[in-house]
């Protein structure tokens, strides 16, 4: 028998690699079984978990999982940093793992690197 | 039950190119991360890097400098390493493995395959 | 990057007899999220690794009970409590808290 426990599918140590200006949407896949829970992003701030209030954010159904979604429009410079979602659930707190986004300002390049070149950034793949 | 298979070339010419791919059966890799170690014969293991499959992105062992690429096929449920200018330190068995990347709850390795670097 | 040192390189124990493996990390190995990634190995002759122990002490599905895990922040022990012929192995512990993924050298467990 399946678990009915909220659980939150972000993997452990994930990253996106993102540009300032462009849009972008930062997904909390939830697993439910009855009631959806309140789902809730903070930004890590050292050790603390700052919530992130007036933010704009939507759910995505799909036919297993919901996402609640936290849209950057667009994505500044100061987003860079680690993100976590989390649960109300039965009057507990269920976490994710962070996630971070890696944001380059396009201004101090001087053409948009690709995908590729992006991942070799040294700061990226060998931290 | 999650398994893997290594296939690819078991010689390669100094300065060549050395190809592996890693074919997964019972998980889909979307949610998993996969990762290459190596083994030179007799002695210790050593990660090589790790590939995100729902997005492509990757981390490598820096002792590895840019020699190391790690790629994965979601349609096919499989990746793939390329390790370019290799010598005969190079040799060793290498593996690919898979883990859970939500709830580290499955690590699994495969068969490895042996690679020696000889002209 | 992190080194995993482990002690000692062999070891012999009679069938029966309780084995310990230590590993220790140059730093710590606890996560920002309050967990502790070591892992431990078991490379029986001829095979490929699998992995017995993770999360300092979580057996993986189908590990025999008489394996177990111990440890926090740098010092970690893998304690076999009555070893049988088909312990026979190298055990690497690896750290999975920073990149790039560190093992220790191994440790050779023989039969007497």
């Known amino acids: 028998k399946e678990s009915c426990d909220v659980q939150l599918y972000i993997k452990r140590q994930s990253y996106h690699s993102i540009f300032a200006g462009d849009p972008f949407k930062l997904e909390c896949p939830v697993k439910y079984c009855a009631h959806r829970p309140q789902v809730t992003w903070c930004k890590l701030n050292g050790t603390t978990c700052v919530k992130l209030e007036g933010r704009h954010t939507s759910w995505k159904q799909e036919k297993n999982l919901s996402f609640f979604i936290l849209h950057f429009e667009p994505v500044l410079p100061s987003d860079n940093g680690s993100y976590r979602c989390s649960a109300n659930f039965l009057s507990a707190i269920i976490e994710s793992h962070s996630t971070t986004l890696y944001v380059t300002d396009v201004k101090s390049a001087s053409e948009r690197p690709s995908k590729d070149e992006m991942a070799s950034r040294p700061w990226l793949l060998y931290s | 039950q999650v398994q893997l298979q290594e296939s690819g070339p078991g010689l390669v010419k100094p300065s060549g190119t050395l190809s592996l791919t890693c074919a997964a059966s019972?998980?889909?890799?979307?949610?998993?991360?996969m990762y290459w170690v190596r083994q030179p014969p007799g002695k210790g293991l050593e990660w090589i890097g790790r590939?995100?499959?729902?997005?492509?992105?990757?981390r490598y062992n820096p002792s590895f400098k840019s020699r190391a690429t790690i790629s994965a096929d979601k349609s096919k449920n499989q990746a793939s390493l390329k390790l370019s200018s290799v010598t005969a330190a190079d040799t060793a068995v290498y593996y690919c493995?898979?883990?859970?990347?939500?709830?580290?709850?499955?690590?699994?390795w495969g068969q490895g395959t042996l690679v020696t670097v000889s002209s | 990057d992190i080194v995993m040192t482990q002690s000692p390189d062999s070891l012999a124990v009679s069938l029966g007899e309780r084995a310990t493996i230590n590993c220790k990390s140059s730093?710590?190995?606890?996560?920002?999220?309050?967990?502790?990634?070591l892992n431990w190995l078991q490379q029986k002759p001829g095979q490929s690794p699998k992995r017995l122990i993770y999360?300092?002490?979580k057996l993986d599905s189908g590990v025999p009970d008489r394996f177990s895990g111990s440890g926090s922040g740098t010092d970690f022990t893998l304690t076999i409590s009555s070893v049988q012929a088909e312990d026979l192995a190298v055990y690497y512990c690896?750290?999975?808290?920073?990149?790039?993924?560190?093992f220790g050298q191994g440790t050779k467990l023989e039969i007497k």
């Open positions: 590939i995100d499959p729902a997005n492509g992105y990757t």
């Open positions: 019972g998980v889909n890799i979307k949610d998993t991360y």
């Open positions: 999360l300092v002490s």
């Open positions: 493995a898979v883990y859970d990347g939500y709830y580290e709850s499955f690590d699994v």
């Open positions: 730093q710590s190995l606890l996560d920002s999220d309050g967990k502790t990634y």
């Open positions: 690896w750290q999975g808290t920073l990149f790039p993924r560190t």
